[in-house]
Interface confidence: low
């Protein structure tokens, strides 16, 4: 056991927030400013991410964890760890290569991101349109004759909006 311990890498004792400094007899040195090590036994510290431009800092870098960025107002995050910012559009619009464009007739978008989606086709369920759709809102389907039996609900609420991030971009 003692022999195994003596052969152990001395760097394994260096905690997160430090690095094993080969230039100083492998002692544990603190990470320099604007760098971090999130695990022990590191031989170098990683440079902190800088949230510049359209990115803004959500969480400052520390000696043990990287900075986290989000997007400045008017943009939303895309990609793992908010690697990109994409421009918001208004409800009733979608982002195209030529910027924000209004949803075409018969489609809607109730979010500031994502694509315009077709209105629900009430007739497929044998229902009628109770409230017309707009660029920002889906249609509301009214009852079919079979739904008008006593005790039945008279209005089918619109389908819940998809969670942000789940719309295909």
């Amino acid at each position: 056991f003692e022999r195994t311990r003596s052969l152990q890498d001395p760097c394994s004792n260096c905690p997160a927030g430090t690095f094993c400094d080969n230039n100083r007899n492998q002692i544990c040195s603190p990470c320099p400013p604007n760098s971090f090590s999130s695990a022990g036994g590191q031989r170098t510290c990683d440079i902190c991410r800088q949230c510049k431009g359209v990115f803004r800092t959500r969480k400052e870098c520390s000696s043990t964890s990287n900075a986290e960025c989000d997007c400045t107002p008017g943009f939303h995050c895309l990609g793992a760890g908010c690697s990109m910012c994409e421009q918001d559009c208004k409800q009733g619009q979608e982002l195209t290569k030529k910027g924000c464009k209004d949803c075409c007739f018969g489609t809607f978008n109730d979010q500031k991101r994502g694509i315009c989606r077709p209105w629900t086709n009430c007739s497929l369920d044998g229902k009628s349109v109770l409230v017309n759709g707009t660029k920002e809102r889906d249609v509301v389907c009214g009852p079919s004759p079979a739904d008008l039996s006593p005790g039945a609900s008279s209005v089918t609420p619109p389908a819940p909006a998809r969670e942000p991030g789940h719309s295909p971009q």
């Epitope: 431009g53 359209v54 803004r56 400045t72 107002p73 008017g74």
Partner: nanobody, 122 residues
Framework: EVQLVESGGGLVKPGGSLRLSCAAS????????MSWIRQAPGKGLEWVSH????????DYADSVKGRFTISRDNAKNSLYLQMNSLRAEDTAVYYC???????????????WGQGTLVTVSS
């Protein structure tokens, strides 16, 4: 009405140069920070560079530092982006954008141009 109109895009070979211009009207151009922002095909928007109202403060994204130069001519109400040593990954629609005057330098954009396409390909 605020208007920003970009021009100068086009097809260029890798290693080549282009100069983009943005003509501003409808506001006091010399009061505003201005930015260039780009969007590569199928990608999100990427901030490229900005310049303060007087031109004294300039900053660049790391991806273009040393290759791109932003400048402005307040007398001509114009913003410029000189792009040298162009690479395939610089292919994008380039937009000029006006920064919100209440928060200059914070990258909160309140007006955009329609964009100009830069294609870098051999």
């Amino acid at each position: 009405e605020v208007q920003l109109v970009e021009s100068g895009g086009g097809l260029v070979k890798p290693g080549g140069s282009l100069r983009l211009s943005c003509a501003a009207s409808g506001f006091t151009f010399s009061d505003y920070y201005m930015s260039w922002i780009r969007q590569a095909p199928g990608k999100g928007l990427e901030w490229v560079s900005h310049i303060s109202s007087s031109g004294s403060t300039i900053d660049y994204a790391d991806s273009v530092k040393g290759r791109f130069t932003i400048s402005r001519d307040n007398a001509k109400n114009s913003l410029y982006l000189q792009m040298n040593s162009l690479r395939a990954e610089d292919t994008a629609v380039y937009y000029c954008a006006r920064e919100d005057p209440r928060m200059p330098g914070t990258f909160d954009f309140d007006n955009w141009g329609q964009g100009t396409l830069v294609t870098v390909s051999s």
